[in-house]
């Protein structure tokens, strides 16, 4: 399906022209990572893939934008406060923590490109640094001195 | 051919809980996101959510978090709707529709199953 | 969370016409809107994506227009396979919204 398709130039636009303008500031995700404190969900498992597995186990929810690329991202959600026990896989051992690890990708977002005269001359792409919490970790608690 | 299987029709009691299954053939399940539908009274369309096969992420109607709960097998190229604490107002046709895309510009509800009645009541 | 209206509920033609079917939103959808048609068994197709693409095997009959606000479905010449209940929904944010759905019947 061809959702842009006035996407980048329009006819006649040098490539050169298109704008790329670099963000270093990070757009943060949709929402805060709160753990999630329903006890069910709150397990490692012994089979499945490695989010489910972790002893600080998480799960991954969309974020989609349709005029970014890439459109759909994955935002990873601790599904625990502190880390699961290796021997049991269910209960939970306060000693650690379970924080997301977070990431700085690349986007790009699509914008109305203006010509001369303030003029539409089609989309440009506009990079951008987004965070997106990759997964999980087990680590130990921070002491305040 | 694409097809999607769902299972048959439900009456449960009001407070239980009950899982609709969606069996997908004839793609790469995997591959495409897969949504879930709710109709009402033979009319109202209501957009639940949806999950992604590969890597469970998934994306919910506020209005059915905690009431709705999306999961799949992908060694059997199913996808599972769990309901929870059934009231009458759950009573509807459940449909689960396969999200068509082109590589990376998606959206639209391409290929749906024949729907799953849930009855609620005592 | 966008609202999209069908204002006509119900609709009667004959065999032949021309028919167009409304939807607006309640803002800008920048075409990201599905047309969908369920027959009276239930089955559900699609059959308009990005305003007026047409799905793969669907009767060129059918078309779609539209831009910002104001969408329409246009079945150009109406067969008996026709009769069923229209729905349009956006897709420009999440969670993805429905029309409440046109109700095509034969004069």
């Known amino acids: 399906y061809s959702h842009w398709p006035s996407c980048c130039p329009s006819k006649g636009q040098d490539t050169s022209e298109e704008l790329l303008r670099w963000s270093t500031v990070p757009v943060p995700p949709l929402e805060p990572a709160r753990p999630n404190r329903h006890p069910e969900s709150c397990r490692a498992s012994e089979d499945g893939p490695l989010n489910s597995r972790a002893i600080s186990p998480w799960r991954y929810e969309l974020d989609r934008d349709l005029n970014r690329l890439p459109q759909d991202l994955y935002h990873a959600r601790c599904l625990c406060p502190h880390c699961v026990s290796l021997q049991t896989g269910s209960h939970m051992d306060p000693r650690g923590n379970s924080e997301l690890l977070y990431h700085n990708q690349t986007v790009f977002y699509r914008r109305p490109c203006h010509g001369e005269k303030g003029t539409h001359k089609g989309y440009c792409l506009e990079r951008r640094l987004y965070r997106v919490s990759l997964a999980c970790v087990c680590v130990r608690p921070r002491v305040m001195g | 051919e694409v097809q999607l299987q769902q299972s048959g029709p439900e009456l449960v009691k009001p407070g239980a809980s009950m899982k609709i299954s969606c069996k997908a053939s004839?793609?790469?399940?995997?591959?495409?996101?897969m949504n879930w539908v709710k109709q009402s009274h033979g009319k109202n369309l209501e957009w639940i959510g949806l999950?992604?096969?590969?890597?469970?992420?998934?994306s919910y109607n506020q209005n059915f978090k905690g009431k709705a709960t999306l999961t799949v097998d992908k060694s059997s190229s199913t996808a599972y709707m769990e309901l929870l604490s059934l009231t009458s107002e759950d009573s509807a046709v459940y449909y689960c529709?396969?999200?068509?895309?082109?590589?990376?510009?998606?959206?639209?509800?391409?290929?749906w199953g024949q729907g799953t009645s849930v009855t609620v009541s005592s | 969370d966008i609202q999209m209206t069908q204002t006509t509920s119900s609709l009667s033609a004959s065999l032949g016409d021309r028919v167009t079917i409304s939807c607006s939103a309640s803002?800008?959808?920048?075409?990201?809107l599905n047309w969908y048609q369920q027959k009276a068994d239930g089955t559900v197709e699609l059959l308009i994506y990005?305003?007026?693409s047409l799905h793969s095997g669907v009767p060129s009959r059918f078309s779609g227009s539209g831009s910002g606000t104001d969408y329409s479905l246009t079945i150009s010449n109406l067969e008996p396979e026709d009769i069923a209940t229209y729905y349009c929904?956006?897709?420009?944010?999440?969670?993805?919204?429905f029309g409440g759905g046109t109700k095509l019947e034969i004069k």
């Open positions: 929904q956006q897709y420009s944010k999440l969670p993805y919204t």
């Open positions: 004839g793609y790469s399940f995997t591959d495409y996101t």
């Open positions: 990005y305003t007026s």
């Open positions: 803002q800008g959808i920048s075409n990201y």
């Open positions: 999950i992604n096969p590969y890597n469970g992420g998934t």
């Open positions: 529709a396969r999200e068509g895309y082109d590589g990376y510009l998606y959206f639209a509800m391409d290929y």
